[in-house]
């Protein structure tokens, strides 16, 4: 069976084809080759000699037991080599020779017992080394690591490392500029020698499900003393063994580390006193809790010095009391409990993501809700009922506003967005908004993107509601049950580039409303009921138009509409997916492609 | 279409068939077997994925006695610092995991429950596997 040509001459997918040897019928120009799940078993030297341009090679689960000297010799452009799930028993010293551009080596689940004997010391370009799910017992980083000056990611998770000694990391002292992220999760650790991490600098350290008791966790974290780490991730996994006990003593050792960003990811334990628990983390710049349960929500008004707070997939009794003077970014998403939003006091806040919480807002939105006048980004999408009771007074700095899939109330009672002269992006898609007031978008003089799909209009008619949106470049009006539009609806949108009118109920096409759209490049009218043109004579669309989508409409392929069908043929160079433009009537022509139709009509006198 | 039996409990019998062409082997054990009146137990899965499990989610299509419920999307792996350790599993890596579950207080009516589980993962998104579970529910007298 042949390989699948994904990108001609470049990418070939040869997965699970029962190949016992490397195929010789692929072009020399192949750059990406997936040979996974084939029983190759043995790689002799120069195995890939006929792929001189190769950049990505996937050999996952190829039952490879032996890799000879120079197996990849000649692959001087290879950047990624994946060996996941091969039961390697014999790895020659020169197995990886010739890989002068290799940046990513994945040797997950390959029976690797030690880094010491892994022959990769010459791979100077290596950025990512993944040796997770192996049998490595010692964390001693071999001397050859001093050659790997570009290494950024080292994944040693799911190995058998129990102890870390001072001598294990000696090589890192010789590499002070290293920007290394290290994952040691799922190693059964019970001892870290104090001083092992002294004066070591890491970009990221991840330790999840490493400790089988509170005491072990406590002493191991104390063993990290002296470490300078940009981002520290601690926690557990839901499907692994969890700590039976967790209290403030667990994290006391963090006072002896220099940490820029901290994240606690999943803990099967109720956090009650977070002030004491995170006492050593009051001055990290970014603090993050993922999938934890928090009992006392008042604690978030303590004087923490965080600039970014992230609470994701957590459980709360009620919406937390947030009073944080220095906080600039708050991400509070996919949380449970506390369904009603209550005011927060965050005077420095610039970025606020409150999406996917099922929250309801009794009144939205003004400075008093968020305690800030600096807000630039606000995401309230995928929430409950949001009642618009104020038009963003004190929030004039907003540039990005997202309400999609929340239920907006009172949107047509006043000019909700009147204050937002700096707003660039607005999404009110699927918000149950019924447009019944022409001033709905007044004030949005800087707006560039407006998404309002899945809403409705009074009498299914699009009125002149965009008159002030002179900078708009993207407008989505799909799924709005529209049947008609004002001929001047788009007259002020001279910068508009993309207009989506798909999935509405238009029965005819008219070019007149688009005559002022001098920048229009994409017009999507798919999934309507267009049978014919509104006027007998259709003008041309703006000359800037490059893509016109008229697929899945109800074209009437009869003599009566001959001029419209001819007009469509004249637009051929603009049309996309023409094979999906089919006749709906008459029945004998149903399903026929409109463009292949040859209608010759005689005028009956 | 070959049917794979999972287990029997006092009020339910559970089996599955593949609903994709590939039919990559997957081993599923539930211990103790699910009882629909209330249940607590362990789900054990052994599987070698044909693509990375990063950003794994399930589309669930549930049918109760021929009545179709709306499609549900269950996100399992968000993409970074996920709840489950198997979210970091790579294509070709053995996934051998045990997940605890519990539910109570749901009354199910007698009949045949079908649940099509479409597992989607990776970037770009592609189907990982598709299984159709059949649960025959026979509420016992008490």
């Amino acid at each position: 069976e042949p390989c699948v040509e994904v990108v001609p001459n470049i990418t070939y997918q040869c997965m699970e084809l029962n190949f016992y040897k490397i195929p010789d019928n692929l072009p020399f120009s192949t750059k990406n080759l997936d040979l996974s799940f084939n029983p190759l078993r043995h790689l002799g030297s120069y195995s890939f000699f006929s792929f001189p341009e190769l950049q990505v090679l996937d050999l996952s689960r190829c039952e490879i037991q032996t890799i000879e000297d120079g197996a990849y010799q000649s692959l001087s452009h290879l950047s990624t080599l994946i060996l996941t799930g091969n039961p390697i028993q014999s790895l020659a010293l020169g197995a990886f020779s010739g890989l002068s551009s290799l940046q990513k080596l994945v040797a997950v689940e390959t029976n690797l017992a030690s880094l010491e004997n892994f022959p990769i010391g010459h791979l100077k370009t290596l950025k990512e080394l993944n040796v997770a799910h192996n049998l490595i017992q010692s964390f001693k980083l071999p001397e050859y690591f001093s050659n790997l000056t570009n290494l950024e990611h080292l994944d040693l998770s799911s190995n058998k490392i129990q102890s870390i000694y001072c001598t294990d990391l000696r090589v890192l002292h010789q590499m002070p500029l290293l920007n290394l992220s290290l994952d040691l999760s799922l190693n059964p650790m019970n001892f870290i020698q104090p001083g092992a991490f002294k004066e070591i600098r890491l970009h990221k350290l991840t330790l999840r499900n490493n400790f089988d008791s509170l005491n072990v966790m406590k002493t191991c974290i104390q063993g990290l003393a002296g470490l300078e780490v940009h981002r520290l991730v601690l926690g557990e996994f839901r499907n692994e063994g969890n700590l039976e006990k967790f209290d403030k003593s667990a994290l006391e050792g963090l006072c002896n580390l220099t940490i820029e960003e901290f994240r606690l990811a999943y803990l099967d334990y109720y956090l009650d006193d977070i002030i004491d628990l995170f006492n050593c983390l009051t001055n990290v710049s970014s603090f993050s809790l993922v999938s934890v349960t928090i009992e006392r929500v008042k604690d978030f008004s303590y004087n923490f010095g965080w600039q970014h707070l992230e609470l994701v997939n957590c459980k709360f009794g009620q919406f937390p009391t947030l009073k944080l003077k220095s906080l600039k970014r708050l991400t509070f998403t996919s949380n449970k409990g506390g369904n009603a939003f209550s005011e927060v006091d965050l005077p420095s806040l610039e970025f606020l993501d409150l999406s996917r919480n099922g929250l309801s807002f009794k009144g939205c939105c003004s400075q008093s809700d968020f305690g800030t006048t600096s807000l630039k980004y606000l995401d309230l999408s995928f929430n409950g009922v949001i009642t618009m009771s104020s038009n963003f007074l004190g929030l004039e700095q907003l540039e990005h506003l997202d309400f999609q899939h929340s239920n907006l109330k009172q949107m047509s009672e006043f000019s909700v967005f009147l204050s937002l002269r700096n707003l660039i992006y607005l999404d009110i898609s699927h918000t149950h908004t019924r447009v019944a007031f022409n001033g709905i978008f007044n004030g949005l003089s800087s707006l560039e993107v407006l998404k309002m799909a899945g809403n409705s209009f009074q009498e299914n008619f699009l009125p002149d509601i965009f008159t002030e949106l002179r900078n708009l470049t993207f407008l989505d009006l799909s799924q709005c049950q529209l049947e008609q539009l004002s001929p001047t609806a788009f007259n002020s949108l001279s910068s508009l580039q993309v207009l989506n009118m798909s999935h509405n109920n238009f029965f005819s096409l008219d070019t007149f409303p688009y005559k002022c759209l001098n920048s229009l490049q994409v017009l999507d009218y798919s999934l309507n009921h267009i049978m014919t043109s509104k006027k007998q004579e259709l003008q041309h669309f703006p000359s800037s138009l490059a893509f016109l989508n008229l697929t899945q409409n109800d074209f009437a392929c009869t003599c009566e509409h001959q001029s419209f069908l001819q007009w469509i043929k004249d637009q051929r160079q603009l049309l996309v997916e023409v094979e999906r433009m089919e006749c709906a009537t008459p029945s004998d022509k149903q399903g026929m492609p409109v463009l292949s139709l040859n209608i010759t009509c005689q005028m009956n006198k | 279409q070959k049917q794979y039996w999972v287990c029997n409990s006092s009020d339910a019998s559970i089996s599955y068939t593949y609903c994709d062409k590939m039919q990559y082997p997957i081993s599923i054990n539930v211990n103790p077997c699910i009882e629909l009146k209330r249940s607590k137990g362990l789900l054990h899965i052994f599987y070698i994925p044909r693509r990375d499990l990063k950003q794994l989610y399930f589309n669930l299509y549930i049918t109760v006695n021929t009545m179709n419920l709306p499609k549900r999307k269950e996100v399992i792996c968000r993409g970074s610092d996920d709840d489950y350790s198997f979210c970091r599993a790579l294509k070709g890596e053995t996934v051998n995991t045990t997940i605890s579950f519990s539910f109570k207080g749901i009354k199910f009516s007698k009949g045949k429950y079908k649940c099509v589980v479409e597992a989607i993962s990776g970037s770009p998104e592609e189907m990982l596997f598709c299984l159709e579970f059949v649960i025959l529910h026979q509420p016992n007298s008490n």
Epitope: K21, I22, D24, F28, L43, G44, Y46, F48, F49, S50 | -
Partner: nanobody, 112 residues
Framework: EVQLVESGGGLVQAGESLRLSCVAS????????MGWYRQAPGKQGESVAI???????YYPDSVKGRFGISRDNAKNTVYLQMNSLKVEDTGVYYC??????RGQGTQVTVSS
């Protein structure tokens, strides 16, 4: 056991030609991918010519139009014709049989 023996190397002036030969023993080359790989001191090795069993050939841009590879399956031999040699063509030239190995190499030196 597969053995590959190269010959034909030597010292030439820039602009001159050389023809390298490689005789294989222990296996028939007719179904094998064959080629030449060169290694210059202090430089990254590179494949300079490849020929598949169907006769299709590959040359990198650095030698395209100057080098030509051919095979004689009856003689179990592969040839590399090198014309308009440049100083940067200097190095050890190895005969390769994909997946099976290489010969001991033959030195080619091009002087200015």
């Amino acid at each position: 056991e597969v053995q590959l023996v190269e010959s034909g190397g030597g010292l030439v002036q820039a602009g001159e030609s050389l023809r390298l030969s490689c005789v294989a023993s222990g296996i028939s080359i007719s179904t094998e991918i064959m080629g030449w790989y060169r290694q210059a001191p202090g430089k990254q090795g590179e494949s300079v010519a490849i020929v598949k069993s169907d006769g299709s050939t590959y040359y990198p841009d650095s030698v395209k139009g100057r080098f030509g590879i051919s095979r004689d399956n009856a003689k179990n031999t592969v040839y590399l014709q090198m014309n308009s040699l440049k100083v940067e063509d200097t190095g050890v030239y190895y005969c390769i049989m994909a997946g099976r190995g290489r010969g001991q190499g033959t030195q080619v030196t091009v002087s200015s």
